[in-house]
Amino acid sequence: QRLPRMQEDSPLGGGSSGEDDPLGEEDLPSEEDSPREEDPPGEEDLPGEEDLPGEEDLPEVKPKSEEEGSLKLEDLPTVEAPGDPQEPQNNAHRDKEGDDQSHWRYGGDPPWPRVSPACAGRFQSPVDIRPQLAAFCPALRPLELLGFQLPPLPELRLRNNGHSVQLTLPPGLEMALGPGREYRALQLHLHWGAAGRPGSEHTVEGHRFPAEIHVVHLSTAFARVDEALGRPGGLAVLAAFLEEGPEENSAYEQLLSRLEEIAEEGSETQVPGLDISALLPSDFSRYFQYEGSLTTPPCAQGVIWTVFNQTVMLSAKQLHTLSDTLWGPGDSRLQLNFRATQPLNGRVIEASFPAGVDSSPRAAEPVQLNSCLAAGD
């Protein structure tokens, strides 16, 4: 079964580029149509530091002791999210001559739709996940991963590409979203913030996590990325939130310990193969799923996003290493490399578990506002 195709006549009027400058196209939301989170201010009108809420203003969330101490997304307090202060900095871009889709950066010019028109699409990523509005889909079975435990040799390329750190994966890592929905893993990369500023791409009820891992997959129905771009289900990304825990994460340390070697933009090193599945949460049965896009140019749509409910814990030192080691172009740090959340424009996020059930004593009946569109598949 596959996520249903998004309707072209969705109730909201158009998509947001997620960039600093609002677009002039008629079908894009105006300031009053779009919450601040989804329509970040331009570079020239970014709020000053004194306007930004501090860490103490963010909802405090304590992890549960179960499941490796990982926080569950549905355990987050339901708060009305103010405009997200952690806007991506104007500091991470690649600038390779002759490669139009390399001429982009987080924040500022050029507007992404000028780099790739798909970035102005109506069904973009990332998005804000609201568990209460997610449609419970019993048909969404536990994810299946095969071949993700790699031997030390051959080694893998770990690269600072100027907008993230990317680990290129070898052939043979197979992932299934369900029967007949088979993929092979291509690469993984991370998104992060800066000191005291979270940097996940997806948010939950407006809450941004310290960091986020993306494992990018190509459908076995397609030979190449170029052929899969923009095709429904052609690409699939497994996403998990990273947050602070008391202990060092040994799986992540195998990568984080090598970041100093690739501090410079465009540099790379070889790292021993590792258990890629150890970088993900252990619970493959509870997740959110929706159809969106790549979160960087070319912003191609049709990407199936699977966001784990369980998070991954890294130590404070590890999160600091992630956000404070790499450099982008020039003399700028590679930080805050996340895109602003994009409007759903009528899309329904599906959940493999009853995420919208309110367990508080006041709730007489579980509340589920959206029904699963794929239940009959």
Epitope: K96, E97, G98, D99, Q101, G147, P154, E155, L156, R157, R159, N161, Q166, T168, L169, P170, P171, G172, R184, A185, L186, Q187, V216, L218, A223, R224, V225, D226, E227, L229, L235, G266, E268, Q270
Partner: antibody
Framework: EVQLVESGGGLVQPGGSLRLSCAAS????????LIWVRQAPGKGLEWVSI???????YYADSVKGRFTISRDNAKNSLYLQMNSLRAEDTAVYYC????????????????????WGQGTLVTVSS | DIQMTQSPSSLSASVGDRVTITCQAS??????LSWYQQKPGKAPKLLIY???KLASGVPSRFSGSGSGTDFTLTISSLQCEDFATYYC?????????????FGGGTKVEIK
């Protein structure tokens, strides 16, 4: 017409250097993974070097440290700088292009090379 | 390092024969395998990409199959113009040295 044309081959003494060029026409090579392949007289094809669209370069063990692959997107050309040449480097050298646009930032791998150049002969002999 | 083992190294066949050439990778390469035809004095020509997909302009008598480590090129009914040398190319990685390799080649001769 999409085309690759190699040049720069010739006779060189052992220990000498040579720079091969591969000029592209009919397409912009900047977004493609490119490869150099060689074929010694009467022998099979041997992969020499590859460069992805981020200009990361990789080599066969037999040429590592002696050969350097590079590209000039403005000139729409691929190069192979060959130093410390040996008799066993004598071969026809071909350049070839990944058949579709490369997305190496997405871990994309080439699954076929097309088109190919006509080849240029390098002879290393004293 | 990846190695590609191609067999047979040569074969004799007649027009109309069905010809099968195999290639084995030393480690799984999924479907990142291509087949090439080369005639004397000419550059290689792409026949099959992604293990089983026919390149543009290639006759349908050519087909490829396999995934992982074992691959096959089949010519269902050999024609005069098919007498040539055939090579497989496997790609395990382009982000490490020695991440790609050709098979040793199969020379298809007239019986």
């Amino acid at each position: 017409e999409v085309q690759l044309v190699e040049s720069g081959g010739g006779l060189v003494q052992p220990g000498g250097s040579l720079r091969l060029s591969c000029a592209a026409s009919g397409f912009s090579l900047s977004r493609y993974t490119l490869i150099w392949v060689r074929q010694a007289p009467g022998k099979g094809l041997e992969w020499v070097s590859i460069i992805d669209s981020s200009s990361s370069a990789y080599y066969a063990d037999s040429v590592k440290g002696r050969f350097t692959i590079s590209r000039d997107n403005a000139k729409n050309s691929l190069y192979l700088q060959m130093n410390s040449l040996r008799a066993e480097d004598t071969a026809v050298y071909y350049c070839a292009r990944d058949r579709v646009l490369s997305y190496d930032d997405y871990g994309d791998l080439p699954d076929g090379f097309d088109p190919w150049g006509q080849g240029t002969l390098v002879t290393v002999s004293s | 390092d990846i190695q590609m083992t191609q067999s047979p190294s040569s074969l004799s066949a007649s027009v109309g024969d069905r010809v099968t050439i195999t290639c084995q990778a030393s480690q799984s390469i999924s479907n990142y395998l291509s087949w090439y035809q080369q005639k004397p004095g000419k550059a290689p020509k792409l026949l099959i990409y992604a293990a089983s997909k026919l390149a543009s302009g290639v006759p349908s008598r050519f087909s490829g199959s396999g995934s992982g480590t074992d691959f096959t090129l089949t010519i269902s009914s050999l024609q005069c113009e098919d007498f040539a040398t055939y090579y497989c190319l496997g790609v395990y990685s382009i982000s490490t040295d020695d991440g790609a390799a050709f098979g040793g080649g199969t020379k298809v001769e007239i019986k």
